[in-house]
């Protein structure tokens, strides 16, 4: 699975929440970032994430001259120079400072149930998705026989009208 271009095909800022409307928030603690899943108080500002979409070609014997087999990969950056990474050994989702080109662990295959309801599959561990476990983000194995609609791996993207990237 290779990224077909070094530049994202599109980027936008959105806030990320769980299927049950809990917010994904990011806090700087002891010089590293922690990720929380929590209920926000009314009027409390949601953290924003920069989603960068990349095209990826799936290795395939299919016809179509390379036209078929395209996937969308996303990277998620809540703050400058930090990206969500899959730690497949620990089954955890972590924020790490990285330089471009980003490591494969920072890329997730995008799935969606509708335009604003999405799931993120680890590029480095197919079948493993970002999910919610004990009020934290974790990597969750989804059995291929299961429907991807399982709620703990579904996230909502809501648009933001602020165009800065904090």
């Amino acid at each position: 699975m290779s990224i077909t271009g070094i530049s994202p095909i599109t980027e936008y800022l959105a806030s990320l929440s769980t299927y049950n409307d809990q917010s994904i928030t990011f806090a700087l603690e002891d010089e590293s970032y922690e990720i929380y899943v929590e209920d926000l108080k009314k009027d409390e500002k949601k953290d924003k994430v920069l989603l960068s979409y990349y095209e990826s070609q799936h290795p395939s014997n299919e016809s179509g001259d390379g036209v078929d087999g395209k996937m969308l990969m996303v990277t998620l950056s809540p703050t400058k120079d930090f990206w969500l990474h899959a730690n497949n050994k620990e089954h955890s989702v972590e924020l790490h400072k990285s330089e471009k080109p980003l490591p494969d662990q920072a890329f997730f295959v995008l799935h969606n149930m509708h335009s604003n309801s999405v799931s993120f599959e680890s590029k480095t561990d197919p079948g493993v998705f970002i999910g919610v476990k004990d009020n934290h983000l974790a990597l969750i194995k989804v059995d291929s026989s299961e429907n991807l609609s399982t709620e703990n791996i579904l996230f909502k993207l809501s648009e933001t009208h602020h165009h800065h990237h904090h």
């Epitope: 095909i9 599109t10 936008y12 959105a14 979409y53 095209e55 799936h58 395939s60 299919e62 016809s63 179509g64 036209v67 078929d68 087999g69 395209k70 996937m71 969308l72 295959v109 995008l110 799935h111 969606n112 149930m113 509708h114 335009s115 604003n116 429907n147 991807l148 609609s149 648009e159 009208h161």
Partner: antibody, heavy 121, light 106 residues
Framework: EVQLVETGGGLVQPGRSLKLSCVAS????????MYWIRQAPGMGLEWVSS????????YYLDSVKGRFTISRNNAENTVYLQMNSLRSEDTATYYC??????????????WGQGTLVTVSS | DIQMTQSPSVLSASVGDRVTLSCKAS??????LDWYQQKVGEAPKLLIY???NLQTGIPSRFSGSGSGTDYTLTISSLQPEDVATYFC????????FGQGTKVEIK
């Protein structure tokens, strides 16, 4: 080469039913969202229905909700549109389309040639 | 529901002209916008996806731009084979087409 072939159109009386089929080839069907889009004679395009790659999620235009049902058979590379209680305003060419990327509902990368449905007494 | 409004409805230009088609969304659609070309008697064809990405095999005279609610399709040098109706389409929230712009040669 990607191919989408729609069948099942024809002349039908108001209130009756029709089932459209779209047979796909040249790509891994089970990885893609599929769609039905229609175009009334001389008019613009109108999205009708969507189904995700595993068939577990379906979406409909408000005016067809409860009357139309989209489904798919991934083993046979086919997507269907069951149209019940047809109305004269459903008269259109119905196009089948495939998504642009695996697993996502973004863009219609390929379209079939369409099948004409005429609802008239 | 998001409404998409295209302008003009009909555009008449000469071969070689730079042509600009406009599409306005009723809400921010985060660049989740495509342009489709439909020639008479044919199925529509994807030209541009995610606002500014050219679909494989489409001539480079076609380009897209925009953000928020305002989007544009530009044909840098109109060719006779570009005579068609062009539809914008949003997929940020649900799926909605604009009503189309018919491009003719003067």
């Amino acid at each position: 080469e990607v191919q989408l072939v729609e069948t099942g159109g024809g002349l039908v009386q108001p209130g009756r039913s029709l089932k459209l089929s779209c047979v796909a080839s040249g790509f891994t069907f089970s990885n893609y969202w599929m769609y039905w889009i229609r175009q009334a004679p001389g008019m613009g395009l109108e999205w009708v229905s969507s189904i995700n790659n595993d068939g577990g999620n379906t979406y409909y235009l408000d005016s067809v909700k409860g009357r139309f049902t989209i489904s798919r058979n991934n083993a046979e590379n086919t997507v269907y549109l069951q149209m019940n209680s047809l109305r004269s305003e459903d008269t259109a060419t119905y196009y089948c389309a495939k998504g642009h990327y695996y697993y996502t509902s973004y863009s219609f990368a390929y379209w079939g040639q369409g099948t004409l449905v005429t609802v008239s007494s | 529901d998001i409404q998409m409004t295209q302008s003009p409805s009909v555009l008449s230009a000469s071969v070689g002209d730079r042509v600009t088609l406009s599409c306005k969304a009723s809400h921010n659609i985060n660049k989740h916008l495509d342009w489709y070309q439909q020639k008479v008697g044919e199925a529509p064809k994807l030209l541009i996806y995610f606002t500014n990405n050219l679909q494989t095999g489409i001539p480079s005279r076609f380009s897209g731009s925009g953000s928020g609610t305002d989007y544009t399709l530009t044909i840098s040098s109109l060719q006779p084979e570009d005579v068609a109706t062009y539809f914008c389409f949003q997929y940020n929230s649900g799926w909605t087409f604009g009503q189309g712009t018919k491009v003719e040669i003067k």
